[in-house]
């Protein structure tokens, strides 16, 4: 008789990251019985919402359940039937939901009321929607990379099984970049985190880990722009905004009720001359970067140390891993690899933002025009914020990794979300029987 | 400003494969699915199939399915629709489209022309 | 497959007058608590133009005066008042489950 094989004890589970630019759906996937161990989970799928972030459907909040249905839908093909009421279902929306928040509590509510609504629909287990914090985004991305690199394993090996891992338990730091915020979290060597609202206390696997995380909201790539966008349209001499953090030749017209939209720009507000204004590219790297700068202020600091903006920042410490649009962006722009220097980085920035327009298009035919013309804004804007913002130097610059998935897993937030909301990180190392689900974080 | 340029019309032989495309410029593919349709000449619309192209996932009518293949190339941001195993009842305008929500919300539609494709022996 | 029946197969109507032209599916097309419905105008020797979405969302750029409702399996479309760039042929569309089918169209000529 043949041997049929039994079927697999697996468990699954779906987290969606509704973030300020766009959705995507992560299902995970473990085996039933290792729930306990340490870097047994992984994604099995992504599916990105086709569209805007769920922000966008303020004004028709009816159609956000035909918005989400392809990718419920995926998830539905991809776990098998057995397992869907068993199945949990999070999402966790991130800034562009903060800030629709600060403008109308009514209205944030309201969109979180039909999302939560629509995805009730579906045959999983829905466990809520809700806007989950910038601390908790800054130490869910820390969880997930140093869950996936195997930091929180008390096995030594001899091999290495994931890349970055240098074979010590010495956590990476998480370096995250969204549209509308921007985390930096990492365990400081030794130094007591001056600001409580920034220090993080977890027992995970039976070690103690003092983190200091940040989110700098309104510093994510977009909002980042449009405070740029507001800070230069006030000193122009009339409805032509020449910016240099855009290629030679391009041209684009900005309704000046779209630049103060946002709570971002509010600091910049003023009344203009005109209704529209057009932006001009000059694309310099130099001049790009001066004003960029002029979005951190690093004149005042109660602290020992600063970032910017008087928000207190331990001394760097480690390896980081840079992940989101760090990763999207310097992929893009081929600048990924860990030989690449950050002067060298600077170099390829500079030739980049020069190249006129008109051959960016042609040489990037499958690229949405609206992200194309970006990427020079938003490389120069990475370097000044890891370099001015963070106080990397061109020799701590080999430190930070740009990480898009590790071990087949996207880096990012919503695994350690996950992981978190399942129970699946023990604060005590678990014996070879796993422990009834005691403490955790 | 979003255009769908799809290839020229094609008479084929009974049997042959064809293969057409529609050059999508002023929208980035990866940022929605694309529609094939066809209508046989005065009669109405066949929904063929579609393609998600940021990861290559096609679902078909059944009946196309194994004789019809939808690929697409976001590089040059085109898709493209392969017939094989013609037959005269294949005669039709095939149109590709997009259709989906964009940046701001707005639920868009946009077309190809139409690509006649003539089975004739 | 779901089945789509439209009726009637040609309207004959006067300009200003309100157009109906109703759908029916062969089953549901309901699915978490949306009608996958959608409704084309095609104009002769011119590609199909979505105009209502989910059964009732009106498309980008259409008219109010294009409007549509229902659930389940019957579905409608109105056009109140029509105006002469009206007049052409409107199919029904189910995209609940592939194969996603159109229904067999409808003529709206003028009276």
């Known amino acids: 008789t043949q041997n049929k094989a039994l079927p697999e004890n697996v468990k699954y589970g779906i987290v969606l990251d509704a973030g300020s630019s766009h959705t995507s759906l992560y299902i995970y996937k473990w085996p039933a019985e290792k729930e306990n161990d340490t870097g047994v989970v992984h994604q099995v799928e992504e599916c990105r919402v086709k569209g805007p972030g769920i922000s966008k459907f303020v004004q028709k909040v009816n159609e956000i359940g035909i918005y989400l249905t392809d990718c419920m839908e995926r998830a539905r093909e991809v776990i098998p039937r057995s397992q869907h009421q068993e199945t949990p279902v999070y999402l966790g929306a991130t800034a562009g939901m903060r800030l629709l928040r600060m403008e109308s509590e009514e209205l944030a509510d309201r969109v979180l009321d039909v999302v939560e609504r629509s995805l009730s629909n579906y045959p999983f287990d829905f466990q809520g929607a809700r806007i989950i914090t910038g601390q908790e985004e800054g130490a869910y991305g820390w969880i997930t990379i140093n869950y996936l690199l195997g930091k929180f394993s008390q096995k030594t090996r001899w091999f290495s099984i994931v890349p970055y891992e240098t074979n010590n338990q010495e956590t990476f730091g998480a370096l995250d970049l969204g549209g509308a915020s921007t985390q930096v979290t990492f365990v400081p060597q030794n130094q007591t985190i001056e600001s409580p609202d920034n220090a993080l206390q977890f027992r995970l696997y039976g070690k103690d880990y003092n983190v200091y995380t940040h989110s700098f909201l309104c510093y994510g790539k977009d909002q980042a722009l449009w405070q740029k966008l507001a800070k230069d349209i006030q000193v122009a001499s009339n409805e032509i905004l020449r910016d240099p953090c855009f290629h030679p030749g391009y041209k684009k017209v900005v309704n000046v009720s779209d630049l103060y939209k946002t709570p971002c720009t509010k600091r910049f507000e003023m009344t203009l001359p005109f209704q529209q204004f057009e932006i001009q590219g000059i694309g310099n790297y130099q001049q790009c970067h001066q004003s960029i700068l002029e979005l951190f202020n690093t004149s005042y600091c109660p602290y020992s140390q600063c970032a910017f903006n008087g928000i207190f920042l331990p001394p760097l410490q480690g390896d980081f891993g840079a992940f989101s649009a760090f990763y999207f962006v310097m992929k893009f722009l081929n600048l990924t690899s860990e030989k690449v220097s950050q002067e060298k980085v600077t170099e390829m920035m500079k030739k980049f933002c020069a190249q006129p327009w008109e051959e960016i298009k042609t040489s990037y035919a499958g690229v949405k025009e609206k992200y194309l013309s970006e990427y020079c804004f938003s490389g120069t804007y990475i370097l000044s914020l890891l370099l001015q913002g963070y106080h990397f130097t061109a020799d701590s610059w080999e430190h930070i990794h740009f990480i898009g998935k590790i071990q087949g897993s996207d880096a990012g937030w919503t695994l350690g979300y996950m992981l978190n909301l399942t129970n699946m990180i023990p604060a005590e190392q678990p014996l070879s029987t796993p422990l009834s689900h005691s403490t955790y974080v | 400003q979003v255009q769908l340029l799809q290839s020229g019309a094609e008479v084929v032989k009974p049997g042959a494969t064809v293969k057409i495309s529609c050059k999508v410029s002023?929208?980035?593919?990866?940022?929605?699915?694309v529609h094939w349709v066809r209508q046989p000449p005065g009669q109405g619309l066949e929904w063929i199939g579609k393609?998600?192209?940021?990861?290559?996932?096609?679902k078909f009518d059944p009946k196309f399915q194994g004789r019809f293949t939808i690929t697409a190339d976001t590089s040059i941001n085109t898709a493209y629709l392969e017939l094989s195993s013609l037959t005269s009842e294949d005669t039709a305008v095939y149109y590709c489209?997009?259709?989906?929500?964009?940046?701001?919300?707005?639920?868009?539609?946009?077309w190809g022309q139409g690509t006649l494709v003539t089975v004739s022996s | 497959n779901i089945v789509l029946t439209q009726s009637p197969a040609t309207l004959s109507l006067s300009l200003g007058q309100r157009a109906t032209i109703s759908c029916r599916a062969s089953?549901?097309?309901?699915?978490?608590?949306?009608?996958?419905m959608n409704w084309f105008q095609q104009k002769p020797g011119q590609p199909p133009q979505l105009l209502i979405y989910a059964a009732s969302n009106q498309g980008s750029g259409i008219p109010a005066r294009f409007s549509g409702s229902g659930s389940g399996t019957d579905f409608t479309l109105n056009i109140n008042p029509l105006e002469s760039e009206d007049f052409a042929v409107y199919y029904c569309?189910?995209?609940?489950?592939?194969?996603?089918?159109f229904g067999p169209g409808t003529k709206l000529e003028i009276k």
């Open positions: 002023g929208f980035s593919i990866k940022d929605t699915y």
């Open positions: 089953e549901s097309v309901d699915n978490y608590g949306i009608s996958f």
């Open positions: 393609i998600d192209p940021a990861n290559v996932n096609t």
């Open positions: 569309q189910q995209s609940k489950e592939v194969p996603y089918t």
């Open positions: 489209a997009l259709y989906g929500y964009d940046d701001d919300a707005y639920y868009f539609d946009y």
